[in-house]
């Protein structure tokens, strides 16, 4: 594959992964009601980072958030950070990895400078994703405790009443925020790892000579010395790139010669 | 104004089908769940059936399952209740109800009478 | 099921007494999501419909007047009428609006003495 196809590859796969963060963040359906012992409930709980909502069978949604801080869950208030900490190494990735496409030219900014960038997204997009994915591991653990001990319950709680009365204890399982959570901080570490071994392809190897451009008077043509086997694809920056009259153009555009760095 | 007429009441025979419809105007009728109550003569009331908005969960009363069917068509504004293999203990008056917050029946029609005897 | 008992099946009262009726579910009908009780309360005219007079146990349904007045918790709820006037004379039902199968209550028939 080569560095530019690894490059936006991993690009896209952590903007989809980055996007997955956001709604997995922002989902109501974190925790739902678990409806093993009451499969026909006219009445749906579901909970979210955020909020938590009643779903009738009437079809009347009723959603609260959670107006207080200082009465929430430590695990829930970790979850929600870890959440908005990945989220926003997510955007500081986009932004930095645009910068460091090397499909896209920006003034005069060197390959080697490209290679820091894409390495330095790469990293932030994989510290998104496993930010992403032990949010999402530690909602489900916390999840999975409560629901073990609210069976427990169940079970123990029954003899207040002499066993008159039966009171419902509403369970929650795993809701649909979770799997995106976890396929979302997936993709973006994925994408992330793309984006660190594209930069590999992108570091100029000090042993490779500089590719020179060579102008021949009176013609607009760029002349490389064949015997070189020049163009290495990071060149020098003495290169002329406006020698044709495209205007501002992507470096694809120009053609160059394959190098062990073309190919990962 | 909210109104719902059912239709197709009427006396049969025990075994016998009869399809009972509830014709719904005055609201969005594919915005709400709908219901079917009965009522035996002199008796209270019991829930049949429940649709929900877009057709497709139904939940019944375990005296009617397997027997009765609900059913809406939307584009019709009309709610249906199929009911097969009728027995004398289904004579009742047969209400169709609009469900609202809560879960409550806030709109009733007047009902249909059906009779089954032999 | 959710079973729910009223009582009591029936009573008299003089105009403008109060009364109570009582609706006993044999589950909680609180849902812990929303902390709302899911019962609603029917009043039925001899010959007419049931009219809706209150749903999630306490919140009065637009048009009731206000001297009807629910509420209760859990499992045990109460619907009371603090004046009773000529018009209220009607068999009055409890529903579970909790769980399937929605359930009602067997009723309790309000007479003026």
């Known amino acids: 594959m080569s560095v530019t196809a690894c490059q936006g590859l991993g690009f896209v796969v952590s903007l989809i992964g980055f996007a997955g963060i956001i709604a997995a963040t922002c989902m109501d359906q974190w925790s739902t009601q678990d409806l093993y012992n009451n499969p026909v409930t006219a009445v749906f709980n579901y909970q979210g980072l955020w909020r938590s909502c009643v779903r009738e069978s009437s079809g009347f949604t009723e959603c609260r958030g959670y107006f207080t801080l200082l009465g929430l869950p430590a695990m829930l208030q970790a979850v929600r950070a870890l959440m908005i900490v990945g989220i926003v190494l997510g955007v500081i990735g986009i932004l930095v990895s645009i910068f460091a496409l090397k499909c896209i030219r920006i003034g005069s900014m060197d390959d080697s400078a490209k290679a820091k960038m894409t390495l330095t997204s790469g990293i932030l997009f994989i510290i998104s994703g496993i930010c992403a994915i032990i949010g999402v591991s530690v909602f489900a653990n916390m999840l999975v405790t409560n629901f073990w001990m609210s069976t427990a319950n169940m079970y123990s709680g029954m003899g207040g009443m002499g066993g008159m009365v039966q009171t419902v204890q509403t369970r929650y399982t795993f809701g649909a925020a979770l799997f995106v959570g976890w396929v979302a901080g997936g993709l973006t570490l994925i994408g992330g790892v793309m984006m660190c071994i594209a930069c590999r392809g992108l570091t100029p190897d000090d042993s490779n000579f500089k590719a020179v451009s060579y102008h021949a008077s009176g013609q607009n043509v760029a002349y490389r010395p064949g015997g070189f086997k020049a163009s290495t694809g990071f060149g020098s920056n003495t290169r002329n790139k406006k020698i044709y009259d495209g205007g501002a153009r992507t470096e694809d555009d120009e053609q160059s010669h394959p190098t062990k760095y073309d190919y990962v | 104004e909210v109104q719902l007429l059912e239709s197709g009441g009427g006396l049969v025979q025990p075994g016998g089908s009869l399809r009972l419809s509830c014709a719904a105007s005055?609201?969005?009728?594919?915005?709400?769940?709908m219901s079917w109550v009965r009522q035996a003569p002199g008796k209270g009331l019991e829930w049949v059936a429940t649709?929900?908005?877009?057709?497709?969960?139904?939940y019944y009363a375990d005296s009617v399952k397997g027997r009765f069917t609900i059913s809406r068509d939307n584009s019709k504004n009309t709610l249906y209740l199929q009911m097969n293999s009728l027995r004398a203990e289904d004579t009742a008056v047969y209400y169709c109800?609009?469900?609202?917050?809560?879960?409550?029946?806030?709109?009733w029609g007047q009902g249909t009478l059906v009779t089954v005897s032999s | 099921d959710i079973v729910m008992t009223q009582s009591p099946d029936s009573l008299a009262v003089s105009l403008g007494e109060r009364v109570t009726m009582n609706c006993k579910s044999s589950?909680?009908?609180?849902?812990?999501?929303?902390?709302?009780?899911?019962l609603s309360w029917y009043q039925q005219k001899p010959g007419q419909p049931p009219k809706l007079l209150f749903y999630?146990?306490?919140t009065r349904e637009s048009g009731v007047p206000d001297r009807f007045s629910g509420s209760g918790s859990g499992t045990d709820f109460t619907l009371t009428i603090s004046s009773v006037q000529a018009e209220d004379v009607a068999v009055y039902y409890c529903?579970?609006?909790?769980?399937?199968?929605?359930?009602f209550g067997q009723g309790t028939k309000l007479e003026i003495k």
């Open positions: 109800t609009r469900l609202v917050k809560g879960n409550a029946m806030d709109y």
């Open positions: 005055g609201f969005t009728f594919s915005s709400y769940t």
């Open positions: 649709i929900i908005i877009g057709g497709s969960y139904t």
């Open positions: 589950q909680s009908l609180l849902n812990s999501g929303n902390q709302k009780n899911y």
């Open positions: 999630w146990a306490s």
């Open positions: 529903q579970n609006d909790y769980s399937y199968p929605f359930t």
